[in-house]
């Protein structure tokens, strides 16, 4: 059916399929050192890895995409590993009037799927 | 800032960057011929193309991903082209009690971005 269960075991071997991984980055890496004051080092969870057929399919569209990629690999790309949800992060940053604490909802990935 | 505008002009040339493309598929292609009765051929809009630096960034996370990919291409993948929204599609399909019309909200892409 259109809502077949996404496959959850990686056929490529441990750590090869779409998963969450933490990348350490400084404000300098991000080009943010001129406006963000804290934290000065971020633990950035990102989605990495491959999306073999039906692995962690985001939705029906991703399942279709996986199927058509198998039939027409030159025309239809394989699904790719992207965030399914995010963790909010508080940044202390400059404002015109001084310093502010602001929560960013779309900065750090919390979960991943294949879309 | 964290909310810099995503770039919208493709530096790789026409049709190379992330965009919506229509792929024609039969029920047989999708493996749905045993349960879907109509339509027998679907015009499936899908997201294809590359995501060069800051092109159509989905959000702050995608902007960070693009930046870190430039710094650590072996560790951080480039953003990839995925649906930003979907168009509902009505399928006529078999049920235990006969035939039913059902709307699928996540089947056909309507817009694309780089995530």
């Amino acid at each position: 059916s259109a809502h077949a269960h996404p496959r959850d075991s990686c056929p490529l071997g441990p750590g090869r399929c779409c998963h969450l991984e933490t990348v350490q980055a400084t404000l300098e890496d991000l080009g943010w050192s001129d406006w963000v004051l804290s934290p000065r080092q971020l633990q950035l969870s990102m989605c990495v890895g491959e999306c073999p057929h039906l692995y962690r399919s985001a939705n029906t569209h991703a399942q279709i995409k996986a199927r058509l990629h198998g039939l027409q690999p030159d025309k239809v790309p394989a699904p790719c590993c992207v965030p399914s949800s995010y963790t909010p992060v508080v940044l202390m940053h400059r404002t015109d009037s001084g310093v502010s604490l602001q929560t960013y909802d779309d900065l750090v990935a919390r979960g991943c799927h294949c879309a | 800032s964290a909310h810099a505008h995503p770039r919208d002009s493709c530096p790789l040339g026409p049709g190379r960057c992330c965009h919506l493309e229509t792929v024609q598929a039969t029920l047989e292609d999708l493996g749905w011929s045993d349960w879907v009765l109509s339509p027998r051929q679907l015009q499936l809009s899908m997201c294809v193309g590359e995501c060069p630096h800051l092109y159509r960034s989905a959000n702050t996370h995608a902007q960070i991903k693009a930046r870190l990919h430039g710094l650590q291409p072996d560790k951080v993948p480039a953003p990839c082209c995925v649906p930003s929204s979907y168009t509902p599609v009505v399928l006529m399909h078999r049920t235990d009690s006969g035939v039913s019309l059902q709307t699928y909200d996540d089947l056909v892409a309507r817009g694309c971005h780089c995530a």
């Epitope: 001129d34 310093v99 929560t103 | -």
Partner: antibody
């Protein structure tokens, strides 16, 4: 509003492991992306930062205590914990949990819990 | 580790009068971004510390404007323009430029 509450045994024997838990109420420990720290205060003395944990589970420790400290988080229980091994009388202190942005701006503190190390 | 030194150790004050506490660091707390990474905390008797000032001179939410922080590099000052009875307690400065963050020894403010 968000509140922090420390809990754990008030008396620990020398050479044993001190274990404390900080329960976050009024908000989720995994939302907000704050750093969750442990800070202690020896009787009648100043404050000492022990370490912190962030949303990703990544930990930061004071080098002077690093070999004995473990901080962990349990998002399902909305708690983070401190374990300090091989304690001596010098570890007798009031232990506070606190929420900060990185290891600064500790705008939210627990009420503190006194832990005495004695046989 | 960065060493923080506060003075005086004890400060008797008269309500309505100004008060000033000094904090010195063993190395500069001025970041290349132009901000001084120094917090001030007040610990009232029998309570947990509370944040007063962050990044050298920024008042924390809900802190009365009689409190102000100043200074740069290695020398910092917390001023109370008009002391009130509720301001008694131990004041701590804390450097946050480098891990581990370190606190000053504290200044005890009490009413004369």
């Amino acid at each position: 509003q968000v509140q922090l509450q420390e809990s754990g045994p008030g008396l620990v024997k020398p050479s044993q492991t001190l274990s404390l838990t900080c329960t976050v109420s009024g908000g989720s420990i995994s939302s907000g992306g704050y750093y969750w720290s442990w800070i202690r205060q020896h009787p009648g003395k100043g404050l000492e930062w022990i370490g912190a944990i962030v949303y990703s589970g990544h930990t930061y420790y004071n080098p002077s205590l690093k070999s004995r400290v473990t901080i962990s988080v349990d998002t399902s229980k909305n708690q983070f914990s401190l374990k300090l091994s091989s304690v001596t009388a010098a570890d007798t202190a009031v232990y506070y949990c606190a929420r900060g942005v990185e290891y600064q701006h500790f705008s939210l503190w627990g009420q503190g819990t006194l832990v005495t190390v004695s046989s | 580790d960065i060493v923080m030194t506060q003075s005086p150790l004890s400060l008797p004050v008269t309500p309505g009068e100004p008060a000033s506490i000094s904090c010195r660091s063993s190395q500069s707390l001025l970041h290349s971004n132009g901000y001084n990474y120094l917090d001030w905390y007040l610990q009232k008797p029998g309570q947990s510390p509370q944040l007063l000032i962050y990044l050298g001179s920024n008042r924390a939410s809900g802190v009365p404007d009689r409190f102000s922080g100043s200074g740069s590099g290695t020398d910092f000052t917390l001023k109370i323009s008009r002391v009130e009875a509720e301001d008694v307690g131990v004041y701590y400065c804390m450097q946050t430029l480098e891990a581990p963050p370190t606190f000053g020894g504290g200044t005890k403010v009490e009413i004369k």
